[in-house]
């Protein structure tokens, strides 16, 4: 393959074993169009917090308010949907927390916590004190609207007490909920007053009502389930990576590109180069050199390591990632200092991703 290639066909075929470059299923926050949404960045000890949406830096505007660890979106629209991240920059490191925002007419917010704490919900009464059913832990029932990504597990809980001990049954959309109503059925854990549905699908959407009753009375509580369907997306690159770097002549440096993609991504590290003293070809396109790409002979493609650098290595390094949906790229600059100057890590991060325009 030529070491100099024009922009037009830099897409190489990935040969590496199939991998998922992705985060575990992020939490989903749901708002209806026109509503306001407030999210708190769930990271500790954050000196500075920066926010991104779909890998692009998010700044304050007339609808987006950033105050400390809080992000507020006023008058949400479907265009606000996407993968958000907050990055906490500390003196020694940085950490990123991801979450999804889904602005839709369907309501939602997922809950699949483990049943590690249900035993205390099973209240035993003094046999003389006859009592109609009552809720023992209303905090666990406050969130009525649940939106869960397809294929996730859903759990609804109705912790109750009473004497004699009440029974619990479940309705879906006001009718008896039978095992045959869904593929794979469902589990009821009476000890924990819970209904569990695994691997939810769109047909699971609806209202789920727990009816808790004994001979002295009956109470009920309704949850609304929305199943949020995923759709494939082009690669998302973590904001701020690769980061600008500087080193002395003869030093070593690493650029890191963090990729999130459901579909197999193809990663390329590209540098602008000169050919015959020119940076651009006769067609006006820049000369590009592919330094590294994902493939069978390439170790961790998300990292570009440069050893024993020279002044000629200074310049812009581009991390370009493509999948069958689309592509994304971000770049960083390497500054090579004369030997006597000490290197430092630079702060402000990405150059424009539109480097090919």
């Amino acid at each position: 393959r030529p070491s100099f290639s024009l922009v037009e066909d830099t897409t190489l075929e990935p040969e590496e074993p199939p991998t998922k470059y992705q985060i575990s299923q992020p939490e989903v926050y749901v708002a209806a169009p026109g509503e306001s949404l407030e999210v708190r960045c769930l990271l500790k000890d954050a000196a500075v917090i920066s926010w991104t949406k779909d890998g692009v830096h998010l700044g304050p505007n007339n609808r987006t308010v950033l105050i400390g660890e809080y992000l507020q979106i006023k008058g949400a629209t479907p265009r606000d949907s996407g993968l958000y991240a907050c990055t906490a920059s500390r003196t020694v490191d940085s950490e990123t927390w991801y979450f999804m925002v889904n602005v839709t007419d369907a309501i939602s917010s997922g809950d699949d916590e483990d049943d590690t704490d249900g035993a205390e919900d099973f209240v035993s009464e003094n046999s003389n004190n006859k009592r109609a059913p009552y809720w023992t832990n209303t905090e666990k029932m406050e969130k009525r609207l649940h939106a869960v990504p397809a294929a996730n597990t859903v759990k609804f809980r109705c912790p109750a007490g009473g004497n004699p001990m009440p029974t619990m049954r479940w309705l879906k959309n006001g009718k008896e909920f039978k095992q045959e109503h869904r593929i794979g059925g469902y589990k009821v854990r009476n000890q924990h007053w819970s209904l569990i549905m695994e691997s939810v699908v769109p047909s699971d959407k609806g209202n789920y009502t727990c009816v808790v009753e004994n001979e002295y009375g009956s109470i009920n509580h309704t949850y609304h389930l929305d199943v949020v369907e995923r759709s494939p997306h082009r690669p998302i690159l973590q904001a701020g990576l690769p980061a600008n770097a500087s080193t002395v002549v003869g030093g070593d440096v690493e650029f890191v590109c963090k990729v999130y993609s459901d579909a197999q991504p193809h990663i390329q590290w590209i540098k602008h180069v000169e050919k015959n003293g020119s940076k651009y070809g006769p067609d006006g396109l820049p000369y590009l050199k592919v330094l590294k790409h994902s493939g069978i002979n390439s170790s961790n493609a998300e990292v570009l390591a440069l050893f024993n650098v020279t002044e000629a290595d200074a310049g812009e390094y581009i991390c370009k990632v493509s999948n069958y949906i689309g592509q994304a790229n971000q770049s960083a600059w390497l500054t090579v200092l004369p030997k006597q100057q000490a290197p430092g890590r630079e702060k402000e991060i990405t150059a424009s991703p539109d480097y090919l325009e």
């Epitope: 040969e15 998922k20 082009r234 949906i325 689309g326 090919l356 325009e357």
Partner: antibody, heavy 114, light 107 residues
Amino acid sequence: QVQLQQSGAELVKPGASVKMSCKASGYTFTIYNIHWVRQTPGQGLEWIGLIYPDNGDTSYNQKFKAKATLTADKSSSTAYMQLSSLTSEDSAVYYCARGGFDYWGQGTTLTVSS
Amino acid sequence: NIVMTQSQKFMSTSVGDRVSVTCKASQNVGTNVAWYQQKPGQSPKALIYSASYRYSGVPDRFTGSGSGTDFTLTISGVQAEDLADYYCQQHYNTPYTFGGGTKLEIK
């Protein structure tokens, strides 16, 4: 809603060239690949190549590299495929599809005949 | 190039039945497989991506499964409107290749 509108059927002579279009609407044209796929009764569905409209990056199936040229016009949200040195073997239905192959055009029927 | 093989060219089923269309990749493609439905005279329609994720609006009787080299599209409770050709495709590596198709016929 997302739509891909392809140009009409073409009847051309062997040796000629043809340029078909695929006009996208209902989404941000520049951030999704446009794929081109051909369908023949004998060969089924074959991927020809893709273009990323934002920067013009292309990737071709080696089989079609000398046959097809993919371009895109961001201002009109239109992708184009030019096919050259046509023979009767190129007679087929040609589809464009958006990035994840989630939306397809209605197809352009190409007939190469003398 | 990765070869996608749909060994059954034709499958016959009855309304209400459960049917499984299979597809085999010539090498490990992880879960980078999609399924398409094509009715006579129409463009292909995307059903499943990443082996098991249904596109929005696709009836939940269509289920995709598998990883590595073996993949299955299952239709539980076949409807008359499911009469069509079904194609698998790998989106792991260019050139993105399709299976030869399976024609589903309703008895």
